[in-house]
């Protein structure tokens, strides 16, 4: 064996944005025949030796941070990739319009602004299919999302959460969905 | 309430073998990870092994690696260290210590300790 | 050699605050793990003082506090007492061979 053994994989299924009190599975996968897993939480200094962590109902406390690792003999693998577990449903939702509108001809310009009664610094939009969201830390209780040149990849169904820096897993309920229309 | 007690300590020669025992009760000893930690004479602590619940999770610090086992006996609430080959430098207390748990979760921090045995190894 | 470090020694007169720091590095520390604080009384076990940067079991006075930031950590101890005397350990994890390590340890002594 020379080096380390590889990292395994860590994912939240059906997904890493999990509203409260709904199931969640995070499965560490590393190659065939490992002899130990390690799934590790991390800022808590919690553990378990299991390759799979069930959580039947989201809580607060478990948002954040997650890492997993295998053993096979006396060799510990790199660690996985971070997977960061967001509790959505903590706070009331954001509202998110789009200005001018949310029609919008393809080359022109559109920006989508996500507005929150809450005292929050941190906003995430999501497009409907796409794995990741786009952040983007704002003042004055709102963010904007400027589109600029929309072709027709930008339309689809967009939804967007509020949160604090100072707790960046505990989410907003998402925003009414909001569709973006691209015509010409 | 939770004890732990080592035993089987005392004076080995160079390359000598010892086996240490660790008597747990107040607890349910299967539920848990336990360490084996050391502090040479006037020096500080040095974790040495740490054993899973069930006995299959084992690791070693790398002074002691294929030089000492650890096991355990959940049914007599045992847990144990044998050491082989040893060394001057294996003089110390051996503590064994309990790791935090909580619901499904084990914590990388020692809640209980034992009081120690002494290992002497000098010729 | 340790892999946390920590000063050998610190002193303080009765009724003062002292401080203790343990640095880490990247792969323990900084990677995540929480630090830990035990006492060790003169011819005792350690018995655990602060878990998980900043917490108190059960029984330990709130003269005692603990801290976190990066790849260090402090303890801190306010109203210094004459039963304070010990050695101190702070205690993290390792990512790298998942191994768990201590600071060198800290000798307090209390002046007068």
């Known amino acids: 064996q020379s080096g380390p053994l590889p990292k395994p994989s860590l994912q939240a299924l059906p997904s890493s944005l999990v509203p409260l009190e709904k199931p969640v599975t995070l499965r560490c996968q590393g190659p065939p025949g490992v002899d130990l897993y390690r799934l590790e939480k991390l800022s808590s200094s919690r553990y378990q030796d299991q390759a799979v962590l069930f959580i039947p109902a989201m809580k607060r406390s478990l948002a954040g941070r997650y890492r997993c690792s295998y053993q096979n003999g006396s060799l510990w693998s790199l660690p996985s990739d971070q997977l960061e577990l967001v509790a959505t449903g903590v706070f009331a939702k954001p509202s998110l319009s789009a200005q001018p509108g949310p029609a919008v001809s393809s080359g022109g310009d559109v920006t989508l602004q996500c507005q929150t009664r809450y005292g929050f610094d941190q906003f995430a939009l999501y497009k409907e299919g796409d794995p990741a969201p786009y952040k983007n830390p704002e003042r004055w209780y709102r963010a904007s999302f400027p589109i600029i040149t929309v072709t027709a990849a930008h339309s689809g169904t967009y939804r967007c959460y509020s949160f604090s820096s100072r707790d960046p897993y505990l989410w907003s309920a998402p925003s009414d969905p909001l569709e973006l229309v691209v015509t010409g | 309430q939770v004890q732990l007690v080592e035993s089987g300590g005392g004076l080995v020669k160079p390359g000598g073998s010892l086996r240490l025992s660790c008597a747990a009760s107040?607890?349910?000893?299967?539920?848990?990870?336990v360490s084996w930690i050391r502090q040479a004479p006037g020096k500080g602590l040095e974790w040495v092994s740490a054993?899973?619940?069930?006995?299959?999770?084992?690791q070693y610090a790398e002074s002691v690696k294929g030089r000492f086992t650890i096991s355990r006996d959940n049914a007599k609430n045992s847990l144990y260290l044998q050491m082989n080959s040893l060394r001057a430098e294996d003089t110390a207390v051996y503590y064994c210590?309990?790791?935090?748990?909580?619901?499904?979760?084990?914590?990388?921090?020692?809640?209980?300790w034992g009081q120690g045995t002494l290992v002497t190894v000098s010729s | 050699q340790s892999v946390l470090t920590q000063p050998p020694s610190v002193s303080g007169a009765p009724g003062q605050r002292v401080t203790i720091s343990c640095t880490g590095s990247?792969?323990?520390?900084?990677?995540?793990?929480?630090v830990h604080w035990y006492q060790q009384l003169p011819g005792t076990a350690p018995k655990l003082l602060i878990y998980g940067n900043s917490n108190r079991p059960s029984g330990v006075p709130d003269r005692f506090s603990g801290s976190k930031s990066g790849t260090s950590a402090s303890l801190a101890i306010t109203g210094l007492q004459a039963e304070d005397e010990a050695d101190y350990y702070c205690?993290?994890?390792?990512?790298?061979?998942?191994?768990?390590?201590f600071g060198g340890g800290t000798k307090l002594t209390v002046l007068g």
């Open positions: 210590a309990r790791h935090y748990r909580e619901f499904r979760w084990h914590y990388y921090y020692f809640d209980y």
């Open positions: 205690q993290s994890h390792d990512l790298g061979a998942h191994v768990w390590v």
């Open positions: 990247s792969s323990n520390i900084g990677a995540g793990y929480d």
């Open positions: 054993i899973g619940g069930s006995g299959s999770a084992v």
């Open positions: 107040g607890f349910s000893f299967g539920d848990y990870y």
